[in-house]
């Protein structure tokens, strides 16, 4: 295991005033999976609701790199390759757990955080609101 | 904070043989996430590549319930509401972190685990392989 020198400004797990603290083993199961979605499939380019992948990097967070999808168009690509605005490209979102360093820069002290990420886009029929 | 009595069978953060271990404050940010759009969109029904949500339940994991998307059709729904097999419904996958108690039942020791989940489906143009 890696031993990290104690930073006196970082919290001590024995400290009674520190909020409920647990130990988390970061030797992740299933670690060798591909984290770059561009490498694992080209659906982002072939979809009728294509998206771009933006790298969201934060060294104070684990994982430090998260890929965020942004739909390329408001509409969807039709059979002719044109954007059809009678349909909508929308992001599919997923809530994920991440760890955030807290206090910042402390190598072995984190806080759990839930964040919402856009994973990709799908093409949906719009909801039509009829004026009464 | 809450002090948890030490179970002699549970790992010690000072143990050099224990894999890279960090302290995590469990007072989660964004704990009350019920207002997040993850819960409120009906894209799974309105998509041209609609999907069903299947429950993946594991009481020894957090989150205990994860919803897995399964595309309803091989093809995509066209403007007439029929399945068009010239296009393909495919799952969009995302790697997420989950927490697992390790060793089991130790109240303040967890392991991070990465799992791959299908979040929804998108409609893609098929890859055509030409026979030489």
């Amino acid at each position: 295991g890696i031993t990290i020198p104690r930073n006196p400004g970082c919290p001590n797990s024995e400290d009674k005033n520190f909020p409920r603290t647990v130990m988390v083993n970061l030797n992740i199961h299933n670690r060798n999976t591909n984290t770059n979605p561009k490498r694992s499939s080209d659906y982002y380019n072939r979809s009728t609701s294509p998206w771009n992948l933006h790298r969201n990097e934060d060294p104070e967070r684990y994982p430090s790199v998260i890929w965020e999808a942004q739909c390329r168009h408001l509409g969807c690509i039709n059979a002719d390759g044109n954007v059809d605005y009678h349909m909508n490209s929308v992001p599919i979102q997923q809530e994920i757990l991440v760890l955030r360093r807290e206090p910042p820069h402390c190598p072995n002290s984190f806080r759990l955080e839930k964040i919402l990420v856009s994973v990709g886009c799908t093409c949906v029929t719009p909801i039509v609101h009829h004026v009464q | 904070g809450i002090t948890i009595p030490r179970n002699p069978g549970c790992p010690n953060s000072e143990d050099k043989n224990f894999p890279r271990t960090v302290m995590v404050n469990l007072n989660i940010h964004n704990r009350n996430t019920n207002t997040n759009p993850k819960r409120s969109s009906d894209y799974y029904n309105r998509s041209t590549s609609p999907w069903n949500l299947h429950r993946n339940e594991d009481p020894e994991r957090y989150p205990s319930v994860i919803w897995e998307a399964q595309c309803r059709h091989l093809g995509c729904i066209n403007a007439d509401g029929n399945v068009d097999y010239h296009m393909n419904s495919v799952p969009i996958q995302q790697e997420i972190l989950v927490l697992r108690r390790e060793p089991p039942h130790c109240p303040n020791s967890f392991r991070l685990e990465k799992i791959l989940v299908s979040v929804g489906c998108t409609c893609v143009t098929p890859i055509v392989h030409h026979v030489q």
């Epitope: - | 019920n34 207002t35 009906d42 205990s64 319930v65 108690r101």
Partner: antibody, heavy 117, light 106 residues
Framework: QVQLVQSGAEVKKPGSSVKVSCKAS????????ISWVRQAPGQGLEWMGS????????NYAQKFQGRVTITADESTSTAYMELSSLRSEDTAVYYC??????????WGQGTLVTVSS | DIQMTQSPSSVSASVGDRVTITCRAS??????LNWYQQKPGKAPKLLIY???SLQSGVPSRFSGSGSGTDFTLTISSLQPEDFATYYC????????FGQGTKVEIK
Amino acid sequence: QVQLVQSGAEVKKPGSSVKVSCKASGGTFSSYAISWVRQAPGQGLEWMGSIIPWFGWTNYAQKFQGRVTITADESTSTAYMELSSLRSEDTAVYYCARDSEYYFDHWGQGTLVTVSS
Amino acid sequence: DIQMTQSPSSVSASVGDRVTITCRASQGISNWLNWYQQKPGKAPKLLIYAASSLQSGVPSRFSGSGSGTDFTLTISSLQPEDFATYYCQQYSDDPTFGQGTKVEIK
């Protein structure tokens, strides 16, 4: 099979507090939440709040914020709901339920709390 | 809070009848809707989760449908043990329940 066993009926005076317990038998709490739901006589169901014992995370309905405290003791697999500043309209059956954060799939048998002077 | 409105508030039916109960949410809740059955003096019992999924051990005569704001619980052929009060519940936001529908013997 998960079973939630609640403490017995209570009679309380207005202004006092009540603490109801809910013990999970047939296993530990696991990673689920425990929610508390109440039902006044002849009325519908009302969610009060929840706790995830693994983490100590709590979430309270706005209506009960400041008056309800939900805790859990993992060593005994018991969750507690304490309601303070009791009034007559708090007379109800209080249920604990295992909560996946999507649905309540196992319920305790209920605890009747009567508030009367 | 999301309001859940059930209708009817009570229904009289006979054994073998098809019974339909509806539930409307004050805003879109996707499919995060559950149905419970409660008998007098007993705790509620989960019947349907995620709008249409049958909880294990629940008879197949119970079915759920709907998405967004409008949902339905159907009992295809009412049995003597089905006379009870039924509640819908949303979990798109902090959980809220409908006011209940009592299924009585005609």
